[in-house]
Every structure is written in structure tokens, then in C-alpha cells.
Interface confidence: medium
């Protein structure tokens, strides 16, 4: 998939990190362990995951995402307090129901992005994803009633193919290729538009090759990708203009892709 030149903007931003080591590149070190760690990425101004080898490396390495953000993102603690007070619906609220693999029968609750309500579902007991609450109250508190949530959108067509339902990352991919993110636009967590505009490009499951566009919330641009004709998700537009109008300014509602099921 060839990206157009103006779609990949990755010069170093001007924001100064809190500590000089936050500007260091992720260093997995020479050892062979596989330890999930986090580093501050100067290009995206975000803390991101990397795999640490277990020895050497550098100071730009944290055990938790929270620790990385507190150490390297200026003013993070203030925004974190705001988010915790209900200013924003977490990304995992938009994950689709995932019953998991096991064969238990547990009553759980999830936020349904179509109905904008928390609903009951049956969880198998293992794996699954984070849109999974033990009580209705907990689900409502976190996903249904955030103070400054995006306005409800009625025309949401849920994907027939749930991709990597256990995690939502701040990295955008096109056909599994990481797209460099521009430091000049709002980060994903600042995006207040339609939830499907946060989804990664999803080619779907069929064999066709249709030129489509998806919105990359990290670059603030619409990128081209190949759609196979069925499945996929709602971050899928027939023209770049429609993509930008829908996701940048929210002027038009997302139209059905005519997905072949």
C-alpha cells in the first residue's frame, strides 16, 4: 500500500519533555527477555509500548503507562485528574462484546455503542476485553455517563469482525503498517469526534480490492487503504472528502458501506 507523500508527516515536534531521558529512543537492550515496557516517543508526544530485553537499555523505560506519562508528559497529572472525574469516555467503552474463549456462564455488563447504554451479556470467564463490568453501576459510571462525552450518533454500523478486541492502542495502522504520527495535531485522547473515527483501518475479510479512505486521528488526515469488500469497520469512506467531513468536522453522518455479509 503506497501512502501519498502528504499523508505521512513525522518531523520532530517542538514540545519539550520534562526530562532529557524522555527524548531518548526506546532501547530494548542486548538481552533476550520479552518484558512489556513503556517509553516516551518524542515524535508522537505519547507514551508507547515496547518490548524490553531485560538488561541494559536506557532511562526512557517504564513498567507502567501511567508512570511513563507522569514522568514525561508535561501537565499530565492535571489532565489525568480531569479524565478521572468523568470528562471522557475511555477507549475500551467502544470495544465490541467479546465473550472470550472459556465456557463459563458469567453475567456481565458492557457498554453498547449503538444503543449508548450499558447492557447485560454472558462472559465465558477468561480473556475477552476490557468492556466488561461486574455491575451495571460500574459500567454506567465509566462508559454511559461521562460528563463531557461526545454527543450520541445514531447511525453506527458495528463491525462484523472484531479486531484485537483486548487492547486499544494509540498507534494507527494501515493494513498492519504503522503510520508515523504527526506531533502537530491533537492526540487520540483529545479527539472528541465520532468513535469510529478512532478505529484503525480494517481491510475486512473478502478478496476484492477497493480504494477507500480512513481517518487517522493521530495525524488528523485521511489516508488511503485497500478494502476487501466485506467486514471491516466504520472508519471506511469512499472519498477522502467524505472522510474528512465526517471525522474532522462531523458534518455528515457515516453512510453504510453496503457490507456483504
Amino acid at each position: 500500500l503506497s501512502e501519498e507523500a502528504d499523508d505521512t508527516d513525522s518531523e520532530l515536534g517542538s514540545m519539550k519533555p520534562l526530562h532529557t531521558f524522555c527524548a531518548m529512543k526506546a532501547d530494548d537492550g542486548p538481552c533476550k527477555a520479552m518484558i512489556r515496557s513503556y517509553f516516551f516517543n518524542m515524535y508522537t508526544h505519547q507514551c508507547e509500548e515496547f518490548i524490553y530485553g531485560g538488561c541494559e537499555g536506557n532511562e526512557n523505560r517504564f513498567d507502567t503507562l501511567e508512570e511513563c506519562k507522569k514522568t514525561c508528559i508535561p501537565g499530565y497529572e492535571k489532565t489525568a485528574v480531569k479524565a478521572a472525574s468523568g470528562a471522557e469516555r475511555p477507549d475500551f467503552c467502544f470495544l465490541e462484546e467479546d465473550p472470550g474463549l472459556c465456557r463459563g456462564y458469567m453475567k456481565r455488563y458492557l457498554y453498547n455503542n449503538q444503543t449508548k447504554q450499558c447492557e447485560r451479556f454472558v462472559y465465558g470467564g477468561c480473556l475477552g476485553n476490557r468492556n466488561n463490568f461486574e455491575t451495571l453501576d460500574e459500567c454506567k459510571k465509566i462508559c454511559e455517563n461521562p460528563v463531557h462525552s461526545p454527543s450520541p450518533v445514531n447511525e453506527v454500523q458495528m463491525s462484523d469482525y472484531v479486531t484485537d478486541g483486548n487492547t486499544v492502542t494509540d498507534r494507527s495502522t494501515v493494513n498492519n503498517i504503522v503510520v508515523p504520527q504527526s506531533p502537530k495535531v491533537p492526540r487520540r485522547r483529545d479527539y472528541r469526534g465520532r468513535p469510529w473515527c478512532l478505529q484503525p483501518a480494517d481491510s475486512g475479510l473478502c478478496k476484492a480490492s477497493e480504494r477507500r479512505f480512513y481517518y487517522n486521528s493521530a495525524t488528523g488526515k485521511c489516508h488511503r487503504f485497500n478494502y476487501t469488500g466485506c467486514g471491516g469497520n466504520n472508519n471506511n469512506f469512499t472519498t477522502r472528502r467524505r472522510c474528512l467531513r465526517s471525522c474532522k468536522t462531523g458534518l455528515i453522518k457515516n453512510k453504510s458501506k453496503g457490507v456483504v455479509k
Epitope: D160, V162, G165
Partner: antibody, heavy 120, light 107 residues
């Protein structure tokens, strides 16, 4: 009895895409009680789970973080098989690749393994 | 990720010996733990699932126990065909992870 038969090239050039297929007999890729995984094994890394797909009224997939930006696992219901694609390979991706079936996170049936060498 | 650590990494034993292999998870995985046996040039084979359930066709000399973070695989009386590498694996959370393996060799 369930059997998994792997196929695909044993040699891939750096920066290219590794593609393997796992043909299923004795079960269905769209069974609502099965999950289908790819695992690899190399001397440096041991056994490393790469990802899985499963069908529970719709398709789900989950990928390991270490390969998440490069991996695609797809079902092919017409041929009753599933495939692995790993993009932008490097010599570090040299390993024996296995497909496996599990009813949960338990992998009870394994393919025969395919040694994939990444070299120019 | 949940790290799985096995000990010992290798052991030497004689036919008839009782052998114990331990597996420790970096956080609680309740009972989502499996054991596999692998012989040279072959795919791993499921021995025990959910801590203590013997997979069909596996001899009763193999047993498993534990919960939470600490688990044990026991071979009550080692047989010649049991010399192999043994792996534990968790499925409490993604990604599914394996221990580094324990090689059981002939003394």
C-alpha cells in the same frame, strides 16, 4: 480426529511477507467452540504465541503486542483453513511456526511445524 | 504481559524417579494453566489443562497442582519416553505466554 496440516515457504527474504496456511480436518474453522492460534519457537525466544482467531457469532482476533503492527490472521471458511501473514520480516523472525487449535486458551491439537528462515 | 518462570531449567533423573517441575506466574492466573511436553523435532503435546486435568491419552503418572501463581507438574515414576522438554502456559490474559521450558534428561 482433528488434524492440522501446515503449508508455506521455508525461506523468506528480509522485508518481505511470511505467509503460512493451516488446513483443518475433523473440525471447522468457524466452530463456535474452537480458537485457532499461531505460535512460533526459536532458540532465543522459546515458545511465543503470536495470535488467534475465533468465531462466536462473529469473528474475533487477538494479537501479541510484539508482532501486532505486522501480523494478520484470517479465516478461509470455503477451504476450512486459516492463515498467518507476517509483514516486514527480519532474521529475528526465523523460527519454527506452528498452528494450533484450542477450545479456550488450551492448545490441544498442533500442526507439524514449519521452519521459516529469513535470509537474503 | 504475564511472565511465566519455570524451575529448574534442566534436570537429570533416572527411570523410576519422581520428578517435580515448578512454574511461577508474575501475577495470579487462578487456574488458567496448562502443561505441554515436547520431544526433539516434534510439536508440543498437551499433557495437562486447567492445572490438574489430564488430557485424553496421557498416562496417569503425570499430575498437576497449584493455584494463583505457583504450579507444579509431577511425574510419579519417570519412564524412558518421558525424557523431553516441558512447558507451562497461561491463558488468564492476552498475550498467552509460555514458560521457558524444563529439559528432563537421563542421568
Amino acid at each position: 480426529q482433528v488434524q492440522l496440516q501446515q503449508s508455506g515457504p521455508g525461506l523468506v527474504k528480509p522485508s518481505q511477507t511470511l505467509s503460512l496456511t493451516c488446513a483443518i480436518s475433523g473440525d471447522s474453522v468457524s466452530s463456535s467452540s474452537a480458537a485457532w492460534s499461531w505460535i512460533r519457537q526459536s532458540p532465543g525466544r522459546g515458545l511465543e504465541w503470536l495470535g488467534m482467531i475465533y468465531y462466536r457469532s462473529k469473528w474475533y482476533n487477538h494479537y501479541a503486542v510484539s508482532v501486532k503492527s505486522r501480523i494478520t490472521i484470517n479465516p478461509d471458511t470455503s477451504k476450512n483453513q486459516f492463515s498467518l501473514q507476517l509483514n516486514s520480516v527480519t532474521p529475528e523472525d526465523t523460527a519454527v511456526y506452528y498452528c494450533a487449535r484450542g477450545g479456550s486458551g488450551v492448545m490441544d491439537v498442533w500442526g507439524q511445524g514449519t521452519l521459516v528462515t529469513v535470509s537474503s | 504481559d504475564i511472565q511465566m518462570t519455570q524451575s529448574p531449567s534442566s534436570l537429570s533423573a533416572s527411570v523410576g524417579d519422581r520428578v517435580t517441575i515448578t512454574c511461577r506466574a508474575s501475577q495470579s492466573i487462578t487456574n488458567y494453566l496448562n502443561w505441554y511436553q515436547q520431544k526433539p523435532g516434534k510439536a508440543p503435546k498437551l499433557l495437562i489443562y486447567d492445572v490438574s486435568n489430564l488430557q485424553s491419552g496421557v498416562p496417569s503418572r503425570f499430575s498437576g497442582s497449584g493455584s494463583g501463581t505457583d504450579f507444579t507438574l509431577t511425574i510419579s515414576s519417570l519412564q524412558p519416553e518421558d525424557f523431553a522438554v516441558y512447558y507451562c502456559q497461561q491463558y488468564s490474559g492476552y498475550p498467552l505466554t509460555f514458560g521457558q521450558g524444563t529439559k528432563v534428561e537421563i542421568k
